[in-house]
């Protein structure tokens, strides 16, 4: 028999955590697990419990986490890595829509995230979506073209900026931009 199936690792309420705000990491394996091991990668830091509660997010807690579990003498495969991001480390970028935030169905729009700092990475979030669109750019701005807009593209967007040198320390979110599809 091979290794046990991997557990899931999630951050609640989100893996994007404003500085000083709480977050809980939870490792979930099958019922009746003997032992969990949760670790922060590249840190030599571990615990034997399934739940890690962080009462106040700090810069040094940002990074990659994973977990596994043991039943008898067998260890599971490791969970997928969880990227825990500290937000609010830097000032917020600005988010704009070109040619504008109201667009006709079937038309094109470009969301542009811009920062005063020399960041080379940008992330665009749509409220309700689980994952961001990431776009590495060099010149302090990133463009996110949306071609052939549909009603599904309407909603609230925010962007973040950060540096590839510190990929888990992000800016505060931009002010929200409401994209309206008519």
């Amino acid at each position: 028999s091979g290794p046990l199936p991997k557990p899931s690792l999630q951050a609640l309420p989100s893996s994007l955590v404003p500085l000083e705000k709480p977050v809980t990491l939870r490792c979930q394996g099958p019922p009746g697990v003997d032992l969990y091991r949760l670790e922060k990668l590249s840190s030599s830091r571990y615990q034997d419990q399934a739940v890690l509660f962080i009462p106040a997010m700090k810069r040094s807690l940002a990074g990659r986490y994973r977990c596994s579990y043991q039943n008898g003498s067998l260890w599971s495969l490791p969970s997928d890595q969880l990227e825990l991001v500290a937000t609010g480390v830097f000032a917020k970028p600005s988010l704009s829509a070109q040619p504008g935030p109201a667009v006709s169905s079937g038309g094109d729009v470009t969301l542009q995230c811009q920062t005063r700092y020399g960041f080379d990475q940008f992330a665009l979030y749509k409220e309700g979506d689980p994952a961001p669109y990431k776009n590495p750019e060099r010149w302090y701005r990133a463009s996110f073209p949306i071609i052939t807009v549909t009603a599904a593209h309407s909603g609230t967007y925010r962007c973040y900026s950060f540096s590839s040198r510190d990929p888990y320390l992000w800016s505060a979110p931009s002010d929200p931009l409401e994209l309206v599809v008519t």
């Epitope: 949760l38 670790e39 922060k40 615990q47 419990q49 890690l52 962080i54 106040a56 700090k58 040094s60």
Partner: nanobody, 127 residues
């Protein structure tokens, strides 16, 4: 810094038990991750067990998991290591250490993360 003093070491027969205690003084104790290490003659100092500032999170080296139990009492500024099923390979000097700077509760197995150390207590397992 935290000042630390271990006690409870001694001579014990194989299969026996021993409880080590570490008394701490200093205002940062309740914010510190605490760890126990041991050092056998001619060997490196090794991590054995650690406990978070709240006591909710623990971590054990594979060699002692299931035999040793770490606990702490923040009201009394003490951390303890209950050692059961001792064998001759456990013979070493046992050290208590504090990691006061880490803001989380994950326990480091790395010596360099602990900046306060006791002087150690000798544990000898022999018949």
């Amino acid at each position: 810094q935290v000042q630390l003093q271990e006690s409870g070491g001694g001579l014990v027969q194989p299969g026996g038990s021993l409880r080590l205690s570490c008394a701490a003084s200093g205002r940062t104790f309740t914010r510190s991750i605490m760890g126990w290490f041991h050092q056998a003659p001619g060997k490196e100092r090794e991590f054995l067990a650690g406990i978070s500032w709240s006591g909710a999170n623990t971590y054990y080296a594979d060699s002692v998991r299931g035999r040793f139990t770490i606990s702490r009492d923040n009201a009394k500024n003490t951390v303890s290591l209950q050692m059961n099923s001792l064998n001759p390979e456990d013979t070493a000097v046992y050290y208590c250490a504090a990691d006061p700077s880490h803001p989380g509760s994950l326990i480091s197995t790395r010596r360099s993360d602990y900046d306060s150390w006791g002087r150690g207590t000798q544990v000898t397992v022999s018949s």
